[in-house]
């Protein structure tokens, strides 16, 4: 879908990954001055969510709120403008926003190979495993947008594991990972404990924690 | 004023499919969601699927699962509805109607049906 | 075998003030979806009558009125006349896997001589 009006920007707060009956605030903004504001989940027939938008200092923008999170509210996620209503003349749609349910299963164990403490240069590998079936491992890291995922291996000493190469070390961080079933791609496990990774003989050593932006005020629509 | 003008009445054989069109004229159609519902004779109403299609989204009801396929042509402001492997028990009046995207299930405007016989 | 059920048939003399009631259940009414209400009079298409709960489009007369409560909703309509002789049928969506949108059994609404 093309659209008249170039596409709106599509944001979690606090993230994308959302615990169990916890909340995420789907914000849509723009530069445009869209009137309404226009969320679907993809997939679904009757997912779609309006909003009318407000505008501020030149952006328009609506906050959805998503929750309590279950299952059925995990998903694909697009947000369109429009400055029209009945009909609508939507914009081309957002970047796609999968919205994840964590908290689901026990979690994983995260370790580290050679140890969580590295040399900087030096190759270190971070290892998910757990004894459930898990068919597939994410690995987050805090202050990045997106997970890295692999499949889990066959079962090796009563465990399914996957193994993370990160390459040679730069700078460290703090590491999460999650297990999902292929035909629940949205519904992940537990948080694993965090992990986290230190880099010496390297002047930038540590990973900052993100700031989260705040949510925005306004009435937000509510899908649940 | 819009109008959703549905393709004329047929006979089918068993085993055999029926496509049925629904054109919207005197308005725009990619803007709202295509749903498809027939009523067999002296019964109710039973919705099959609809289509969404600016989202391209289309959902299909678990009675119909595998057997109907509907779809949208933007270009030519119509949508379809095709039903395979018919039996007698799909002889009914198959009607295509409107919602809002944000209300797909309230059907503000109907096609005027069409009738699909299934006889051998 | 209807998701939502209705009464097969209700009747009244003119002017009079009937009720058609929609039961559905927790996956459906009761989860907080809106009910729609249709009239179809003889040998033509549905025409949405009642949108949203309670809401009339243009051109419907407010001598009818719809509302919800629960897992049920109900149509009444006031100062029955002729020309309301038809079948109503209610609807509403359900998260449940038995489908996406579904209907009541439909409502026979006859108007007494």
């Known amino acids: 879908h093309e659209g008249v009006h170039r596409k709106p920007s599509l944001l979690a707060h606090p993230g994308p990954l959302v615990k169990s009956e916890e909340t995420v605030i789907l914000q849509c903004w723009s530069d445009v001055r869209f009137q309404h504001f226009l969320l679907h989940r993809e997939g679904k027939f009757k997912d779609t969510l309006h909003l009318i938008g407000e505008h501020h200092d030149g952006v328009s923008k609506a906050n959805f709120s998503i929750g309590p999170m279950m299952q059925d509210l995990a998903g694909t996620y697009r947000c369109y403008g429009s400055v029209t209503h009945s009909p609508y003349q939507l914009s081309a749609p957002s970047d796609p926003l999968d919205i994840v349910i964590t908290g689901l299963y026990e979690k994983p164990s995260l370790s580290a190979q050679p140890g969580p403490t590295v040399l900087a240069g030096e190759s270190v590998t971070l290892s998910c495993s757990s004894r459930s079936s898990y068919d597939m491992y994410h690995l987050s890291r805090e202050g990045e947008a997106h997970e890295r995922r692999f499949s889990a291996g066959p079962k090796v000493n009563g465990t399914f594991q996957a193994d993370f190469p990160l390459g040679p070390a730069t700078h460290g961080g703090t590491y999460r990972c999650f297990g999902s079933f292929r035909d629940s791609p949205y519904e992940w496990s537990n948080s694993s404990d965090p992990l986290l990774v230190s880099v010496t003989g390297n002047p930038s050593n540590s990973w900052p924690s993100p700031t989260e932006p705040s949510s925005e005020t306004g009435n937000p629509r509510h899908l649940h | 004023q819009v109008q959703l003008v549905q393709s004329g009445a047929g006979v089918k054989k068993p085993g055999s499919s029926v496509k049925v069109s629904c054109k919207a004229s005197?308005?725009?159609?990619?803007?709202?969601?295509i749903s498809w519902v027939r009523q067999a004779p002296g019964q109710g109403l039973e919705w099959m699927g609809g289509i969404i299609p600016i989202f391209g989204t289309s959902n299909y009801a678990q009675n119909f699962q595998g057997r109907v396929t509907i779809t949208a042509d933007e270009s030519r402001n119509t949508a379809y509805m095709e039903l395979s492997s018919l039996r007698s028990e799909d002889t009914a009046m198959y009607y295509c109607a409107r919602g809002e995207l944000v209300d797909p299930d309230a059907f503000d405007i109907w096609g005027q049906g069409t009738l699909v016989t299934v006889s051998s | 075998q209807s998701v939502l059920t209705q009464p097969p048939s209700v009747s009244g003399a003119p002017g009079q003030r009937v009720t058609i009631s929609c039961t559905g259940s927790?996956?459906?009414?009761?989860?907080?979806?809106?009910v729609h209400w249709y009239q179809q009079l003889p040998g033509t298409a549905p025409k949405l009558l009642i949108y949203g709960n309670s809401n009339r489009p243009s051109g419907v007369p407010d001598r009818f009125s719809g509302s919800k409560s629960g897992t049920s909703a109900s149509l009444a309509i006031t100062g029955l006349q002729a020309e309301d002789e038809a079948d109503y049928y209610c609807?509403?969506?359900?998260?449940?896997?038995?489908?996406?949108?579904?209907f009541g059994g439909g409502t026979k609404v006859t108007v007494l001589a």
């Open positions: 005197g308005g725009t159609f990619s803007s709202y969601a």
């Open positions: 609807q509403s969506y359900d998260s449940s896997l038995s489908g996406y949108v579904v």
């Open positions: 927790s996956s459906n009414i009761g989860a907080g979806y809106d």
